[in-house]
């Protein structure tokens, strides 16, 4: 666990030519103020896409108006830093949006406004616990100057602050298989994370997983007391009153407290101290009300009927989130069928489609049978995202415009002779054998295999087959 | 064919938790967004708001924001609808139900939800 | 917000009639307007989409029409198996919005 530090400098035009105009006015004075959003990696990601390792919103600034005829100077600052708590390990590469909002404080009707007045990106790689890092982005005409650094909450360490330090409890060394921490060499790294369960008191680890017994105890997790000799040296039971080993992982390991509040130990757990704007057991529910502005983009922010929701930000059309700070994304909506693009407008959401495609939402397969016609009486025939059609008789090819050789493929059977006919085939059947096909044999004494022959028809005789 | 089967009544008290389940098949479930309707007793349908499959970012109605929570589960094909600190006036019928660019094509059978103490 | 208001919350036809269910919206939307069908056991269907097409597997019987504010569901030949309420949605507009509903039963 640890803060993300950030502190802005100043503010201000950049260099060069197209100084940008003063975002405050004597008509229209205002206030500035930083929201900071940070994600783990070196990901290019949206503006809008979630802050995965925290955000920040400063205090608002002094009230600057506008001197006439002055060009825009660096705007009056917020006092103090922007501190993200983050609760995991410092993932080393992060990726940072910094945004400058301006607060209008006119006559607004229904309170101040806001609007984004600058947004910087970057990409970086910092080691918790290192100097501050000073940067300098441009957006637009205007810059921005400012400092960051990672740093860890006690008892957390290191570059990552994964590892976890504890005072000594002994005045000349550390605990078995525990190194000082470096740079508080009077303090001492606690054990590793041992295996689950292992006893806090009498169990120690030099590799994750295992629990070793300090003298005088046994079992797998070194709850099991061996003999009653008291704390003699270093390596004794410990007790809470001869304090003899740095203690064991405690209730405020890992910070359960949220939001950057602090961890006390108490006999039965511990207490969390939370900064303002925050309150419940570890911090988790914020106390932030419609007095602190905290919805974005012009939301209209009503108070909350419970304390899981101390406020609502109603938002206007576009935007989104609990501080209505995203813009609303329509194409998240998935909108485009087939692999279609999708690009929202803001008017309108329109779908780029892949070939073969079309339709507002490529919903179309130009290839099916939308719009496509069989010649010569043929249907069409759907499947697999292509299409076919199914001729009728005498009629072949892809739209069944090509004239097919109905007897091609020798259709009647028996020796039978085949005839192309304007509506098909005909087949004259060999003596003994009857049917469309010629299929059916003639029985002697007359009789068919079918129940009758049609009517008008003698066994024998041409069939046209329809 | 295309289905959503959604988990089954719940009775729960005030302040707990309740996690609702929806089951997609017979289709590409990324290729869809899954969204979430609410209809309370005698009454219409409420749209809570949306999850996109895809990358898991879900938006909800302004009536939906704090207390409720969409999410995936994508290798089993499932979007979940959690709603913490039950309060009596969530006792409704919840929909899960599929987006095809154009409207809700294809809708879950409820999840009766009763909020008593 | 696009606030759907479906004017008639029930109406009562016979087996064989033609019959109209209306909805109007507060700003114009595009056409993204649908009409769904709730039956009695609670399962939701979609019928018409982007105000006239009408859904896979969905009788002819039903069609859609309307533009601007002004939108409407038709079923030409009511059948008992028709009996349902009818919501309309639009689909325009975060957030997407239901009428009222119409609630249709046979006389």
């Known amino acids: 666990a640890g803060v993300f530090e950030l502190q802005i400098h100043s503010f201000g035009p950049g260099p060069g030519p197209g100084a940008p105009r003063s975002p405050c006015s004597a008509r229209l004075p205002c206030r500035l103020f930083f929201r900071v959003c940070l994600k783990p990696g070196l990901s290019e990601e949206a503006a809008e896409s979630p802050c995965a390792l925290g955000a920040a919103l400063s205090a608002r600034g002094p009230v600057y108006t506008e001197q006439p005829g002055a060009p825009a100077p660096d705007l009056p600052l917020p006092d103090g830093l922007l501190q993200v708590p983050f609760r995991d390990a410092w993932p080393g590469t992060f990726s940072f949006i910094i945004e400058t909002w301006r607060e209008e404080l006119g006559d607004q009707i229904g309170g101040p406004a806001w609007s984004l007045l600058a947004r910087v990106a970057g990409r970086r790689r910092l080691a918790a616990g290192g100097p501050w890092a000073r940067d300098i982005q441009r957006a637009g005409a205007w810059e921005l100057r400012f400092s960051y650094r990672a740093r860890c909450e006690p008892p957390a360490v290191g570059t990552a602050c994964t590892r976890l330090c504890r005072p000594r409890s002994a005045p000349s060394r550390c605990g078995p298989g525990l190194r000082p921490c470096a740079p508080l060499e009077d303090e001492c790294e606690a054990p590793l994370v041992c295996r689950a369960g292992c006893s806090p008191e009498h169990g120690f680890c030099e590799q994750p997983g295992e629990c070793r017994c300090l003298e005088g105890w046994t079992g797998p997790l070194c709850t099991v007391p061996v003999s009653t000799s008291s704390c003699l040296s270093p390596r004794g039971p410990s007790s809470a009153t001869t304090g003899c080993l740095v203690p064991g992982p405690g209730p405020c390991d890992g910070n359960p407290c949220a939001n950057g509040g602090s961890c006390s130990e108490t006999p039965r757990s511990f207490e969390c101290t939370c900064p303002r704007g925050f309150y419940g057991l570890r911090c988790e529910v914020s106390g932030v009300t419609c007095a602190d502005g905290p919805c974005f983009n012009g939301g209209l922010c009503v108070g909350g009927a419970d304390p899981d929701s101390a406020y609502i930000c109603h938002c206007p059309p576009g935007f989104q989130g609990s501080n209505c700070e995203k813009r609303v994304d329509r194409c998240s909506l998935q909108p485009c069928r087939n692999g279609g693009l999708c690009l929202d407008l803001g008017h309108a959401l329109r779908c780029r489609c892949r070939a073969g495609f079309a339709g507002p939402r490529c919903e179309h397969d130009l290839d099916d049978c939308a719009g496509r016609a069989c010649a010569n009486g043929g249907t069409c025939v759907e499947g697999g995202g292509a299409h076919r059609c199914s001729c009728a008789l005498g009629f072949g090819g892809r739209d069944c415009r090509e004239r097919a050789d109905p007897c091609a493929a020798r259709p009647c059977a028996h020796g039978g002779r085949c005839y192309a006919h304007f509506s098909g085939l005909v087949c004259a059947c060999a003596p003994g054998y009857m049917g469309a096909r010629c299929e059916f044999p003639v029985h002697p004494d007359g009789a068919s295999a079918l129940p009758a022959a049609p009517p008008g028809l003698r066994p024998g005789d041409p069939q046209r087959y329809l | 064919q295309i289905q959503l089967v959604q988990s089954g009544p719940e009775l729960k008290k005030p302040g707990e938790t309740v996690k609702i389940s929806c089951k997609a098949s017979?289709?590409?479930?990324?290729?869809?967004?899954m969204h979430w309707v609410k209809q309370a007793p005698g009454k219409g349908l409420k749209w809570m708001g949306w999850?996109?499959?895809?990358?898991?970012?879900?938006g909800y109605a302004d009536d939906f924001k704090g207390r409720f929570a969409f999410s995936l589960e994508t290798s089993a094909s499932t979007a979940y609808l959690q709603i913490n600190n039950l309060k009596n006036e969530d006792t409704a019928t919840y929909f899960c139900?599929?987006?095809?660019?154009?409207?809700?094509?294809?809708w879950g059978q409820g999840t009766s939800v009763t909020v008593s103490s | 917000d696009i606030q759907m208001t479906q004017t008639t919350s029930s109406l009562s036809a016979s087996l064989g009639d033609r019959v109209t269910i209306s909805c109007r919206a507060s700003q114009d939307h595009s056409n993204y307007l649908n009409w769904y069908q709730q039956k009695p056991d609670g399962t939701v269907k979609l019928l018409i989409y982007?105000?006239?097409r009408l859904h896979s597997g969905v009788p002819s019987r039903f069609s859609g029409s309307g533009s601007g504010t002004d939108y409407s569901l038709t079923i030409s030949n009511l059948e008992l198996e028709d009996i349902a309420t009818y919501f309309c949605?639009?689909?325009?507009?975060?957030?997407?919005?239901f009428g009222g509903g119409t609630k249709l039963e046979i006389k």
């Open positions: 949605q639009q689909g325009d507009m975060l957030p997407w919005t």
């Open positions: 982007y105000t006239s």
């Open positions: 017979g289709y590409t479930f990324t290729d869809h967004s």
């Open positions: 139900a599929r987006y095809d660019g154009y409207a809700m094509d294809y």
């Open positions: 999850i996109n499959t895809e990358t898991g970012e879900p």
